[in-house]
């Protein structure tokens, strides 16, 4: 097995990332056939993780093609039945080590997921994944443990009918030590350890072992069918057995000699010189969550599986937080309902992302009268007198700009200010000198002039404060019944939209 | 061979029930999600149902034209999804097809429903 | 629902033309869209998927492009068994959704 670039991947690069010695660890995980998130179920069927890790440490310019990897096996032991179907996890994972690595840091390098089909007792089964940058190579195979035996390890074993012990002849199962051995159904003296039987009267061996009744090592195994006794010192002369003794064709796979070799039929899902290899096929379903299967017309062809939105990894097995992208625009509420993705919109925004600024100035930005203003793609406020700020909400001095003209005095009021003019002005800012004998006012003259009457100078200014409030009032008005009606009309919209989600999220 | 059969189509009134099956072969049928998709005379095609994985406790989904009035279900021993159609409309008058995946990648030859008094 | 508007409905063209048919989404559906060809009393089959695309088998005069929410199927020359209805379909968000058909016809 190894793990490392894949071809044609540029330069191979290290798992360490030039951080000091790093080790590499499997953990390997089973879980049933039909498991849909194979990420995210439970590994029902078994896990196990790597062990007798080399450290490896990474040298200027070394390749990093050939890593040191755990040696020895990873047994993942299953206590059911072997389901034949199942899917396979592997996760690479990496260890930094050393001190300025900051203690050991754990990290994972690569997850393969696949629906694998094996039968127990076959030899390995050889398979590559790819992962990103990274290619791993890795066998497999399923072995019962005894009793358990056949292609599915069936146990023969039944339950104790005494919780003390076994009845009389009968030892307890192993590794199912809450169970007894059931009665002998192979034949009379057929090896518990080394021989089983999957119907009545025979005595089948496993792998390394021979005889009629198992018992006998393959290595210093007696002279057996046509193999002739030689001298004493070699045992047995081996002119070689036939080419079908002992059914080289792993997996069901039925032997037929040709010409002096032998040549496998295997079933569907097996391929290789002797059915060793499990294929997966477009037509065994590998993708997840319906995900589309390309390429793999035959077991020796890679599939790709092309995921639904909402879905990654090499077999689609793993769920994408969606909305952990943001793809709500301006402050929408982001809901992930599996294969459709909504985004609830704030007020004054809509479309799928929330994207359509449908009007700047919907939800009511300016504050105490004023208007909203819009251009260059943002909004500001044109504050109404008296007030100040980007949202018109702080209190403003009208008076502080000393807006009377001539003299005038200023004093604050609720619609803004009023101008107490001089004698000799008048207008909303004392702007207008006063002719004499009631002629027409004129912009301001030169000092000099005759005071006009306070009488008139008070209703003109009276005058215009009323119009003033009228305008003001009349504008507030208009204002507050076109966003009721622009709220009304998206409320209806908003409601409708829920009820699509609500029923969305039931389906 | 991949291959979906469909059958049991044909003529209903108004308001009857119809029980379309779909028979796969060629394929490991219990790990493929089965849809119906139903295409009107001279018109497109249009989605009518899901129905997902015994993982995913057999999930149905259905179009909003036909939700209430047809169900789908599926027998995994016997490679074998179903519609079953209830109140039937003369809108609902169409080939139906069965396919797989989400993406619809295998399709049957489509079998004939005609609903008219 | 995300509504697919293909054009043009049908066409005529003759064996070896360069064949265009467009298909305008809704709303930005990504490149979560794929094209399938229906001849007369067949059943659709699948040419394109996620957009550009080829699927299984399916010969390189197709092509398919685009993204978000305008999208082209492209035959480059045209063959005599490729006279048929196409169709694009939307998988971005459920329920799958289809344009109305293209029927590209002989001249």
């Known amino acids: 097995h190894s793990f490392g670039p894949g071809p044609g991947l540029g330069t191979p690069r290290s798992p360490c990332n030039a951080r000091g010695p790093c080790r590499l660890f499997f953990r390997v995980c089973l879980k049933p056939g039909v498991s849909q998130e194979a990420t995210e179920s439970l590994c029902a069927l078994g896990a196990a993780l790597s062990t007798s890790v080399p450290v490896y440490t990474e040298h200027p310019g070394e390749s990093a093609a050939a890593l040191p990897l755990p040696d020895g096996l990873v047994r993942v032991p299953f206590r059911d039945a072997w389901p034949g179907t199942f899917s396979l996890v592997i996760e690479t994972w990496r260890e930094q080590l050393g001190e300025h690595a900051g203690g050991p840091a754990w990290n994972l390098l690569a997850r393969v997921v696949g629906r694998r089909r094996l039968a127990a007792g076959g030899p390995w089964a050889r398979d590559v994944q790819r992962t990103g940058t990274w290619e791993l190579h890795f066998s497999y195979r399923a072995r019962c443990e005894p009793p358990a035996v056949g292609a599915a390890c069936a146990r023969l074993c039944r339950s104790r009918s005494a919780p003390s012990r076994c009845g009389p002849g009968l030892r307890p199962c192993t590794p199912f030590p809450d169970e007894c051995e059931a009665p002998s159904v192979c034949r009379p003296g057929c090896s518990p350890e080394h021989g089983y039987c999957e119907e009545p009267d025979e005595c089948r061996c496993l792998e390394g072992w021979t005889g009629p009744l198992c018992t006998v090592p393959v290595s210093t195994s007696s002279c057996l069918n046509s193999r002739v006794p030689g001298p004493a010192s070699t045992g047995c002369l081996l002119p070689g057995p036939g080419p079908c003794d002992g059914n080289p064709c792993a997996n069901g796979g039925s032997c037929s000699e040709t010409s002096g070799s032998f040549e496998c039929a295997c079933p569907r899902g097996f391929y290789g010189l002797r059915c060793e290899v499990s294929g997966v096929t477009c037509a065994d379903g590998p993708c997840f969550n319906g995900g589309l299967c390309v390429g793999g017309e035959d077991p020796d062809s890679a599939y790709v599986c092309h995921c639904p939105p909402g879905f990654q990894g090499s077999n689609c097995e793993k769920r994408v937080d969606r909305c952990s992208l943001q793809p709500c625009q301006n402050g929408g509420l982001c809901l992930d309902l599996g294969h459709a993705l909504r985004c609830r919109c704030r007020a004054g925004f809509a479309g799928p992302r929330c994207e359509h600024d449908l009007d700047d100035c919907a939800g009511r930005a300016c504050a105490n009268g004023g208007t909203c203003v819009e251009g260059g793609g943002s909004r500001r406020c044109s504050c109404a007198l008296g007030f100040g700020g980007r949202d018109c909400r702080e209190r403003a001095d009208p008076c502080a700009s000393r807006p009377c003209a001539h003299g005038g005095r200023c004093y604050a009021h609720f619609s803004g200010l009023v101008c107490a003019c001089a004698p000799g002005y008048m207008g909303v800012r004392c702007e207008f000198a006063v002719r004499p004998d009631g002629a027409d006012a004129v912009p301001a003259a030169p000092r000099g002039l005759r005071q006009a009457d306070p009488q008139r100078f008070l209703a003109g200014v009276i005058a215009v404060i009323v119009v003033v409030v009228i305008a003001i009032v009349a504008g507030i008005v208009v204002l507050v019944i076109s966003r009721k009606k622009r709220m009304a009309k998206y409320e209806k919209a908003e409601i409708k939209e829920m009820g699509e989600m609500h029923r969305e999220l039931n389906a | 061979e991949v291959q979906l059969v469909e059958s049991g189509g044909g003529l209903v009134k108004p308001g009857g029930s119809l029980r379309l099956s779909c028979a796969a072969s060629?394929?490991?049928?219990?790990?493929?999600?089965m849809n119906w998709v139903r295409q009107a005379p001279g018109k497109g095609l249009e989605w009518v149902g899901q129905?997902?994985?015994?993982?995913?406790?057999?999930?149905?989904h259905y179009a909003e034209s036909v939700k209430g009035r047809f169900t789908i279900s599926r027998e995994d021993s016997k490679n074998t999804v179903y519609l079953q159609m209830n109140s039937l409309k003369t809108e609902d008058t169409a080939v139906y097809y069965c396919?797989?995946?989400?993406?619809?990648?295998?399709w049957g030859q489509g079998t004939t429903v005609t609903v008219s008094s | 629902n995300i509504q697919m508007t293909q054009s043009p409905s049908s066409l005529s063209a003759s064996v070896g033309d360069r064949v265009t048919i467009t298909c305008k989404a809704s709303?930005?559906?990504?490149?979560?869209v794929s094209w399938y060809q229906q001849k007369p009393g067949k059943s659709p089959k699948l040419l394109i998927y996620?957009?550009?695309n080829r699927y299984t088998g399916v010969p390189s005069r197709f092509s398919g492009s685009g993204s978000g929410t305008d999208f082209t199927l492209t035959i480059s020359s045209l063959q005599p068994e490729d006279f048929a209805t196409y169709y694009c379909?939307?998988?971005?968000?459920?329920?799958?959704?289809f344009g109305g058909g293209t029927k590209v016809e002989i001249k």
């Open positions: 060629g394929i490991t049928f219990s790990n493929f999600w």
């Open positions: 379909g939307q998988f971005y968000s459920f329920p799958s959704t």
């Open positions: 129905i997902r994985l015994k993982s995913e406790d057999y999930a149905t």
């Open positions: 996620g957009a550009s």
């Open positions: 396919t797989t995946g989400y993406y619809f990648d295998y």
């Open positions: 709303e930005n559906v990504g490149t979560y």
